[in-house]
């Protein structure tokens, strides 16, 4: 099926420039999933892009451009959760140190930890540099964004029967259309200045009644505060 | 072992339509899209088009809308190309290629290409 | 549609001695691009995936690199094995998976 040139994450659009600056980049040769900036020295993604060797690289906007506001900072330690499980992607968490403090400024700054869950209906921020086609594949330079509601748990359960564990929640559209993608894995879902969701998975992207699935951060809090404690 | 194995030659009459199988084996079937490439004797490789052979989603190269019909059977891990209205200069190599880095349900970045291939199956058009 | 040009058409090379075939997108593919050896009467494999990356089993004597628009596949010494004709392929961008027009190498 041919599928819309001007989609954007899916059914997104262009992020106005550095208008994401907690947005983070994991690069291997190559960008290969996004992160969330948390504090100096720590960014959030997810626990299935995980590899031995990251370049955390912040301040993006276009990936193929040195734009001038990136700073590139190799991981010092990357700590996948431990009840992490491939399989179902429960608990689809990680945490990456910095080997060395980013700059915080206007293009670079961090995201807050959630006080609360994420509540229905409220609408969020999906950001990363995924695939833009549905079917297919179309792969943008600058960072998409997309504005989606959280779903309730039992739309998110009866999307996808038996698979959606606590830990999980479902954002989007039942219509489809507008979704994550491959390549957005690890990046942000924010909703009121908070990170509610790191991007996990989905039955193919934009596809109707299969919206994007995402791990519920509020439910880590403790353990990433004391992952931090821990490694500082 | 993982392998594609694709029915035989062909030989068909302008104006005829021909079905080429190709049999998955030793993974699993619905987890990884499939392709189909030809090529013409003595030429490069051209592609046809894909299925999702979980969903039985298909994208086809433009210039085979509408005569090439891309469908699978879950229960045999077979996927079939059929190409209509043939012409002389359809007589070509047809191969089914695999799509490496299972369709996993992950939105990781994950590099593509097309790392298991058929033996392919020659198709001859001549009246 | 992306375009892929593949350079030289014909590449004569002896054995033991380095060759290095290009690839060029007509737009920024980044690093989506995967390169294919066949031989007379078989079916293409697959040697390097995500523009640099050896799939299994292939001799480290293969490699590839660039990102974007420009990639190189070099065979570092050629064996007897290597005379075959190698093609460059984009996932970057589609449908249309497309294809470069193939480099021949050949003994020289």
């Known amino acids: 099926a041919p599928f819309d040139d001007d989609d954007k994450i899916v059914g997104g659009y262009n992020c106005e420039e550095n208008s994401v600056p907690y947005q983070v980049s994991l690069n291997s040769g190559y960008h290969f999933c996004g992160g969330s900036l948390i504090n100096e020295q720590w960014v959030v993604s997810a626990g299935h892009c995980y590899k031995s060797r990251i370049q955390v690289r912040l301040g993006e906007h276009n990936i193929e451009v040195l734009e001038g506001n990136e700073q590139f900072i190799n991981a010092a330690k990357i700590i996948r959760h431990p009840q992490y499980d491939r399989k179902t992607l429960n608990n689809d968490i990680m945490l990456i140190k910095l080997s060395s403090r980013a700059v915080i400024n206007a293009r670079v700054s961090t995201i807050s930890l959630p006080t609360a869950p994420p509540a229905t209906g409220t609408k969020c921020l999906i950001s990363g540099w995924g695939n833009t086609a549905s079917s297919g594949a179309d792969y943008p330079d600058e960072l998409q964004c997309l504005d989606a509601p959280v779903l309730s748990q039992a739309k998110c359960e009866a999307s996808y029967p038996g698979k959606i564990t606590s830990n999980m929640f479902c954002v989007g559209f039942l219509e489809g259309g507008k979704d994550s993608c491959q390549g957005d894995s690890g990046g942000p879902v924010v909703c009121n200045g908070q990170l509610q969701g790191v991007v996990s998975w989905g039955d193919g992207c934009a596809q109707k009644n299969k919206p994007g699935v995402y791990t519920k951060v509020y439910n880590y809090v403790k353990w990433i505060k004391n992952t931090i404690a821990a490694n500082s | 072992q993982v392998q594609l194995v694709q029915s035989g030659a062909e030989v068909k009459k302008p104006g005829a339509s021909v079905k080429v199988s190709c049999k998955a084996s030793?993974?699993?079937?619905?987890?990884?899209?499939m392709h189909w490439v030809r090529q013409a004797p003595g030429q490069g490789l051209e592609w046809m088009g894909s299925?999702?052979?979980?969903?039985?989603?298909?994208n086809y190269a433009q210039k085979f809308q509408g005569r090439v019909t891309m469908t699978r059977d879950t229960s045999i891990s077979t996927a079939y190309m059929e190409l209509s209205r043939l012409r002389s200069d359809d007589t070509a190599v047809y191969y089914c290629?695999?799509?490496?880095?299972?369709?996993?349900?992950?939105?990781?970045?994950?590099?593509?290409?097309?790392?298991?291939w058929g033996q392919g199956t020659m198709v001859t058009v001549s009246s | 549609e992306i375009v892929m040009t593949q350079s030289p058409a014909t590449l004569s090379v002896s054995p033991g001695e380095r060759a290095t075939l290009s690839c060029r997108a007509s737009?920024?593919?980044?690093?989506?691009l995967a390169w294919y050896q066949q031989k007379p009467g078989q079916a293409p494999r697959l040697l390097i995936y995500?523009?640099?990356t050896r799939a299994t089993g292939i001799p480290a004597r293969f490699s590839g690199s660039g990102s974007g628009t420009e990639f190189t596949l070099t065979i570092s010494s050629l064996q007897s094995e290597d005379f075959a004709v190698y093609y460059c392929?984009?996932?970057?961008?589609?449908?249309?998976?497309?294809f470069g027009g193939g480099t021949k190498v050949e003994i020289k």
């Open positions: 290629a695999r799509v490496g880095g299972a369709a996993a349900a992950g939105k990781a970045y994950t590099a593509s290409a097309f790392d298991i």
């Open positions: 737009q920024s593919v980044g690093s989506n």
């Open positions: 030793g993974y699993t079937f619905t987890g990884y899209y």
């Open positions: 995500g523009a640099s």
């Open positions: 392929q984009q996932f970057h961008n589609w449908p249309p998976l497309t």
């Open positions: 299925i999702n052979p979980s969903s039985g989603g298909t």
